[in-house]
């Protein structure tokens, strides 16, 4: 058993049918010695008396808010949560496996640049009685500071019969140098509590591996005289690291017809312009990627040919 | 990245072209190592990230772009030098700071070259003959060193009398390649910045 926060305790259980569970001793936070009784949650049934209460915690029915009273007055509370270990592996019931970029990916994180700021998000089908708390650091043995905000519900989607909820959090490394070569990964730890179930999820990454630039901005077309060709031009996104000559991007320009089946023409360039043939009803899209370290491509920025 | 990219202008400052070749070569070599050594811990998540140049060179700090010198976190409480202007064209006068940056890059290359050559000698003794260093990568390191045109003492190749532990050697190869790829990215960024200056 360990303390998650004041008066909230996590009991770690080897989870299998007929498991013996864990013996837990609760102590009433009071100078009083006599006339103390204990109850669980809203029940008025007295579970025991005395300054300490010994319980065998086996199932969720044994978890909850234990309260010690004296003469009708509440003295203190202890909330017991359960953390299930199933055959040597901590349970992952609360969050959905996003399966990207690989199986068992519960937390996904992205950064728009090298400033040390990043966003993480996760999915669940649970809509109520759910709380998250996020901590982060650079390295784990001698951790350097990363500050994270509160996790917030950022999207709701309907997936088949289920509603899916997306939560996200923004974090900022306290002292980040964009040009630094990372040797210690960022660690992100999310505590999730659903009713009386506790779970924790972690992700470890280098900022360089989670870079995903914003799409190029100011995408414009300039028709070339007496030609079906157009000059496409764009700019680096505002959120990208500067100077751009040091943090360079490479670009992919795509001409796509109205029909998804039509052949796509693609050109790769390090410049911020390209000359392409604009077909009727086609659209031109441009996306960006770090020129020197191949992390994710940005989303497409698009304009119609007409 | 196996994608068609416009070729650089011939008038471009030569180090940029060599540094681009270097990044391509080390990235290819790392990819090959990860595929060949699939049963070894060779992915970014599995290896220890060690920097053999740590406390010996200070490339990141010495080559920091002027725009980042205002960032306290980049100064790292060391005596830092900043790139001002110049290139590695012999005809242009390079500033003192710039020379410091380029000599730091040169020292990095020299250290990695020695490590890789020593390692290759060990790998050639492996009866499994599982993996060797790409000669192209070693040649590209050499070309960039020549383009930088610094004279420094030659570091003797390390020789060891004991029987090599091939498992450890292959894991060390992975560690070295990951670190060298990261340094090659920095070198490419620096050359790109200098080229634009």
């Amino acid at each position: 058993i360990w303390e998650l926060k004041k008066d909230v305790y996590v009991v770690e259980l080897d989870w299998y049918p007929d498991a013996p569970g864990e013996m837990v001793v609760l102590t009433c936070d009071t100078p009083e010695e006599d006339g103390i009784t204990w109850t669980l949650d809203q029940s008025s049934e007295v579970l025991g008396s005395g300054k300490t209460l010994t319980i065998q915690v086996k199932e969720f029915g044994d978890a909850g808010q234990y309260t010690c009273h004296k003469g009708g007055e509440v003295l203190s509370h202890s909330l017991l949560l359960l953390h299930k270990k199933e055959d040597g592996i901590w349970s992952t019931d609360i969050l959905k496996d996003q399966k990207e970029p690989k199986n068992k990916t519960f937390l996904r994180c992205e950064a728009k640049n090298y400033s040390g700021r990043f966003t993480c998000w996760w999915l669940t089908t649970i809509s109520t009685d759910l709380t998250f708390s996020v901590k982060s650091s650079r390295g784990s043995s001698d951790p350097q500071g990363v500050t994270c905000g509160a996790a917030t519900l950022s999207a709701e989607r309907v997936r088949g019969d289920n509603k899916e909820y997306e939560y996200s959090v923004e974090c900022q490394e306290d002292s980040a140098c964009p040009a630094a070569e990372e040797s210690l990964p960022i660690e992100v730890m999310v505590d999730a509590v659903h009713k009386l179930k506790y779970e924790n999820y972690t992700s470890s990454f280098f900022i360089r591996d989670i870079i995903k630039p914003d799409p190029p901005k100011n995408l414009q077309l300039k028709p070339l005289k007496n030609s079906r060709q157009v000059e496409v031009s764009w700019e680096y996104p505002d959120t990208w690291s500067t100077p751009h000559s040091y943090f360079s991007l490479t670009f992919c320009v795509q001409v796509q017809g109205k029909s998804k089946r039509e052949k796509k023409d693609r050109v790769f360039t390090d410049k911020t312009s390209a000359t392409v043939i604009c077909r009727k009803n086609a659209s031109i899209s441009v996306r960006a990627q770090d020129r020197y370290y191949s992390s994710s491509w940005s989303e497409w920025a698009s304009v119609p040919c007409s | 990245r196996n994608l068609p990219v416009a070729t650089p202008d011939p008038g471009m400052f030569p180090c940029l072209h060599h540094s681009q070749n270097l990044l391509r070569a080390v990235s290819n070599m790392l990819q090959k190592a990860r595929q060949t050594l699939e049963f070894y811990p060779c992915t970014s998540e599995e290896i220890d990230h060690e920097d053999i140049t740590k406390d010996k060179t200070s490339t990141v700090e010495a080559c920091l772009p002027l725009e980042l010198t205002k960032n306290e976190s980049c100064l790292n409480s060391r005596e830092t030098s900043f790139i001002t202007n110049g290139s590695c064209l012999a005809s242009r006068k390079t500033s003192f700071m710039m020379a410091l940056c380029l000599s730091s890059i040169y020292e990095d290359l020299k250290m990695y070259q020695v490590e890789f050559k020593t390692m290759n000698a060990k790998l050639l003794m492996d009866p499994k003959r599982q993996i060797f260093l790409d000669q192209n990568m070693l040649a590209v390191i050499d070309e960039l060193m020549q383009a930088l045109n610094f004279n420094s003492e030659t570091v003797p190749q390390k020789s060891s009398l004991e029987e090599p532990d091939f498992y450890k050697t292959k894991i060390k190869l992975c560690i070295l390649l990951h670190a060298f790829r990261i340094r090659a990215v920095t070198i490419d960024r620096v050359m790109s910045y200098l080229n634009a200056s």
Partner: antibody, heavy 115, light 112 residues
Framework: QVQLVQSGGGVVQPGRSLRLSCAAS????????MHWVRQAPGKGLEWVAF????????YYADSVKGRFTISRDNSKNTLYLQMKSLRAEDTAVYYC????????WGQGTMVTVSS | SYVLTQPPSVSGTPGQRVTISCSGG????????VKWYQQLPGTAPKLLIY???QRPSGVPDRFSGSKSGTSASLAITGVQAEDEADYYC????????????FGTGTKVTVLG
């Protein structure tokens, strides 16, 4: 006392269907994940499928994906394996089993796919 | 296809020490726990070892498990006639958990 009692096995022709049941008692069935494991005559153990405690997630071996469906009825304390488009290579003893460091197995039920 | 490899058979005389190996990889035994089962003819498997080296109550202490790197092993110290059975190791793969990975199985024969 944890008990898993299996039923539903038998002889079936290729291409036909069969449903296996596993009735649980002696524990809170709705709190635990469950597996199906099979063993072809004279062969080793092969995992078939898994279902979470609440039925929210199901996992299948590639060899049965799209043909077999694992399900549970927590109100009846019963685990099921619906097997469709049966093949000769599905002939085996099928076991249900609890998920956890200590596990309990059903007695096994024989499924024979033969024309 | 089995990714956990066991020897098809091992044998020993009563009182001898018999060991069975189970060889896997970094993503299974290398990073997950291992179980061992004993299966007597016509019966369901019986758990002998969980968590690499833990013995459930009721399992004789002549059975012991260990794990090193990407391999695990089961030792029977002082093998007895009633130990003649098939033995299976089981683990998970960190990418496909909770799918069970079973070893190929080992037939233990007690001679004499």
């Amino acid at each position: 006392q944890v008990q898993l009692v299996q039923s539903g096995g038998g002889v079936v022709q290729p291409g036909r269907s069969l449903r296996l049941s596993c009735a649980a008692s002696g524990f809170t069935f709705s709190s635990y994940g469950m597996h199906w494991v099979r063993q072809a005559p004279g062969k080793g153990l092969e995992w078939v499928a898994f279902i979470r405690y609440d039925g929210s997630n199901k996992y299948y071996a590639d060899s049965v994906k799209g043909r077999f469906t694992i399900s549970r009825d927590n109100s009846k304390n019963t685990l099921y394996l619906q097997m469709k488009s049966l093949r000769a290579e599905d002939t085996a003893v099928y076991y249900c089993k609890t998920h956890g460091s200590h596990d309990n197995w059903g007695q096994g039920t024989m499924v024979t796919v033969s024309s | 296809s089995y990714v956990l490899t066991q020897p098809p058979s091992v044998s020993g005389t009563p009182g001898q020490r018999v060991t069975i190996s189970c060889s896997g990889g970094r993503s299974n035994i290398g990073s997950m726990t291992v179980k061992w089962y004993q299966q007597l003819p016509g019966t369901a498997p019986k758990l002998l070892i969980y968590g690499n080296d833990q013995r459930p109550s009721g399992v004789p202490d002549r059975f012991s498990g260990s794990k090193s790197g990407t391999s695990a092993s089961l030792a029977i110290t002082g093998v007895q006639a009633e130990d003649e059975a098939d033995y299976y190791c089981q683990s998970y793969d960190r990418g496909t958990h909770p799918a069970l990975l079973f070893g190929t199985g080992t037939k233990v024969t007690v001679l004499g």
